[in-house]
Interface confidence: low
């Protein structure tokens, strides 16, 4: 019975549990490039780490298929509303999947907020957006974070804006 | 090969999986002491529990090293803006680590919000802040929750403000 | 010693790890029925799945007892404030437990927000509410999501409003 498996399979289960994929990437000054691409992340310094997951150009890359809880938080802030950002234009924060099976990114988890309706034109305002949820990812698929209005993303020391995942 | 291990190690793996560390602590009337210290939590009553984690003076204390998904939600609320809390002064909600390696607390996950810019001076307003992310903790290290403007934290029955963790 | 167990128990531990309960349900046009009941969810199409958990009338149903990280996000939005929704009336988003042991639903995780205080009467506004936390559930217990002001929940393609859980 393939489900009962052998000693080797049990050992493998232990080994894989020991290295159950997980990652936490943190915001850095270079995270927001202003190029329309996904946010970029720190993978090693401070609180950032990769365990059983890869990283490439802003993307967490899976090395094994499975269900993953993926999450991201972005710290938003500004003084009044930046030019062209009316109070009825939302800030969109999302997690997106890239896969060889589709030519375009696939929306996974998305949030919209109207943060700068809170403040008068010259007032400083702050907001935070958190996303998290379980998705199935094949080996080699990539997940990225995008904030369309990336000029509003506030980075600092890696604790305000971050991106992570772990297998469930 | 230390990675293949023995029967005893496999049994240990099963035992530790069975008691994989997890906790969920809930807000109580005594959570906010107004002393400038971290928020305090209920550890046993109602929805609160500790499994493989300790508690001390507001802190979750690890008993084994590893990667933990730590999270906290705080319910914020007020009538207008409390004296001295201008709309451009954010409410800061954070998870912080205490370790023997550093004399001061280390920021792990932090969020800023400008919640009372939403309401006129005499209006009631509500906001909620959620934080969650994976961090590495050594055995004996502590994690606490702080809200600098703790007079704005609204407690009730343990469902609005809470703090938890589990090993990933 | 029951804790050390037998080969069969270790195999069973491996089998159960392989199918550790998890689910992610997504919002659909039929999620908000306007009946005062819980939100309803898509369980199969797109990003939605059930693994070791059941579904019934909006509820995730456990098949085995344990600690679960449960989560939900709802996308809120509107034009100004809907009639009867003053800026001091919060939007309440919560996760609730149904069990045969109690006649009424039990609050697990709850959040309150005052989102439409952000916008003038004719302005479009958006807000998002995320909840997540670890709770203990017995086999057969149910968890549902409620938003009392469900006319403000914005559904679209299953990425904006969702509901999930996994065993920790």
């Amino acid at each position: 019975d393939q489900d009962t498996g052998s000693w080797e399979q049990l050992v493998q289960a232990r080994r894989s549990h020991k290295a159950s994929p997980a990652a936490h990437l943190t915001g850095a000054n270079s995270s927001s490039m202003g190029t329309g691409g996904p946010l970029l992340w720190e993978t090693q310094l401070g609180l950032a780490f990769l365990r059983g997951l890869g990283y490439h150009d802003g993307a967490l890359v899976t090395t094994q298929a499975g269900y993953y809880y993926i999450y991201s938080k972005v710290q938003l802030g500004g003084v009044g509303c930046p030019q062209g950002l009316a109070t009825d234009l939302p800030v969109t924060h999302g997690l997106y999947k890239r896969t060889t099976r589709y030519p375009e990114e696939l929306e996974l988890l998305v949030s919209r907020r109207s943060p700068c309706g809170r403040a008068a034109s010259s007032r400083v305002w702050w907001d935070s957006s958190f996303l998290g949820g379980v998705v199935h990812l094949e080996a080699g698929e990539e997940v990225v974070v995008r904030v369309l209005e990336e000029q509003l993303v506030r980075l600092r020391d890696g604790t305000r804006s971050y991106f992570g995942a772990f297998m469930v | 090969d230390q990675d293949t291990g023995s029967w005893e190690q496999l049994v240990q793996a099963r035992r530790s999986h069975k008691a994989s560390p997890a906790a969920h602590l809930t807000g109580a009337n005594s959570s906010s002491m107004g002393t400038g210290g971290p928020l305090l939590w209920e550890t046993q009553l109602g929805l609160a529990f500790l499994r493989g984690l300790g508690y001390h003076d507001g802190a979750l204390v690890t008993t084994q090293a590893g990667y933990y998904y730590i999270y906290s939600k705080v319910q914020l609320g007020g009538v207008g803006c409390p004296q001295g809390l201008a709309t451009d002064l954010p409410v800061t909600h954070g998870l912080y680590k205490r370790t023997t390696r550093y004399p001061e607390e280390l920021e792990l996950l932090v969020s800023r919000r400008s919640p009372c810019g939403r309401a006129a001076s005499s209006r009631v307003w509500w906001d909620s802040s959620f934080l969650g992310g994976v961090v590495h903790l050594e055995a004996g290290e502590e994690v606490v929750v702080r809200v600098l403007e703790e007079q704005l934290v609204r407690l009730r029955d343990g469902t609005r403000s809470y703090f938890g963790a589990f090993m990933v | 010693d029951q804790d050390t167990g037998s080969w069969e128990q270790l195999v069973q531990a491996r089998r159960s790890h392989k199918a550790s309960p998890a689910a992610h349900l997504t919002g659909a046009n039929s999620s908000s029925m306007g009946t005062g009941g819980p939100l309803l969810w898509e369980t199969q199409l797109g990003l939605a799945f059930l693994r070791g958990l059941g579904y019934h009338d909006g509820a995730l149903v456990t098949t085995q007892a344990g600690y679960y990280y449960i989560y939900s996000k709802v996308q809120l939005g509107g034009v100004g404030c809907p009639q009867g929704l003053a800026t001091d009336l919060p939007v309440t988003h919560g996760l609730y437990k149904r069990t045969t042991r109690y006649p009424e639903e039990l609050e697990l995780l709850v959040s309150r927000r005052s989102p439409c205080g952000r916008a003038a009467s004719s302005r479009v506004w958006w807000d998002s509410s995320f909840l997540g936390g670890v709770v203990h559930l017995e086999a057969g217990e149910e968890v549902v999501v409620r938003v009392l002001e469900e006319q403000l929940v914005r559904l679209r393609d299953g990425t904006r409003s969702y509901f999930g859980a996994f065993m920790v």
């Epitope: 310094l45 401070g46 020391d157 | 084994q64 550093y102 001061e104 050594e138 | -």
Partner: antibody
Framework: QVQLVESGGGLVKPGGSLRLSCAAS????????MSWIRQAPGKGLEWVSY???????YYSESVKGRFTISRDNAKNSLYLQMNSLRAEDTAVYYC??????????WGQGTLVTVSS | DIQMTQSPSSLSASVGDRVTITCRAS??????LAWFQQKPGKAPKSLIY???SLQSGVPSKFSGSGSGTDFTLTISSLQPEDFATYFC?????????FGPGTKVDIK
Amino acid sequence: QVQLVESGGGLVKPGGSLRLSCAASGFTFSDYYMSWIRQAPGKGLEWVSYISRSSFIYYSESVKGRFTISRDNAKNSLYLQMNSLRAEDTAVYYCARWELSPFDYWGQGTLVTVSS
Amino acid sequence: DIQMTQSPSSLSASVGDRVTITCRASQGISNYLAWFQQKPGKAPKSLIYAASSLQSGVPSKFSGSGSGTDFTLTISSLQPEDFATYFCQQYNTYPFTFGPGTKVDIK
């Protein structure tokens, strides 16, 4: 009193291997985080690797994949296995302990010379 | 990596002088900064941690200050045994990095 004594240094050819040891005494070794730091002749200090009480490990980019840090709490010893050595690895290697403050005590160092 | 710079790279001073050495981090490191003293042929010795906390057994003529990116080590009255090289080191993020050092010699 606190003592850290390094050993194992010497002359090695490029591509070769060495294993450094650090014997600790005068304190409860298992309670401390430990590091290796090196200093090339006439140059500044460079942190090499760190190992926590529970053997959680970090390396500098310059040695990652070539050096392995380990500890044996029962023997009060810290080790650095150095493989694929290069000329630029020539340095005095120090072990240092860390608890509340970083590197509060250092060993006297051991010289590693990589040359053909 | 966080780059640490020190100024001056060397200085000449007399016994009894007040000496100040500065250290700058390429990004904010809160107060996670240490200072070390090293004499020729010897291992470094810890003087200051957490930017301003005096290591046990270190005389109070040594003091540290600063937070964020700019830090200072001050020796209030230089003594013969203080002629050495001084290094700063950040331990806010991996990899831990040291400054290039400031050599204090006799004028």
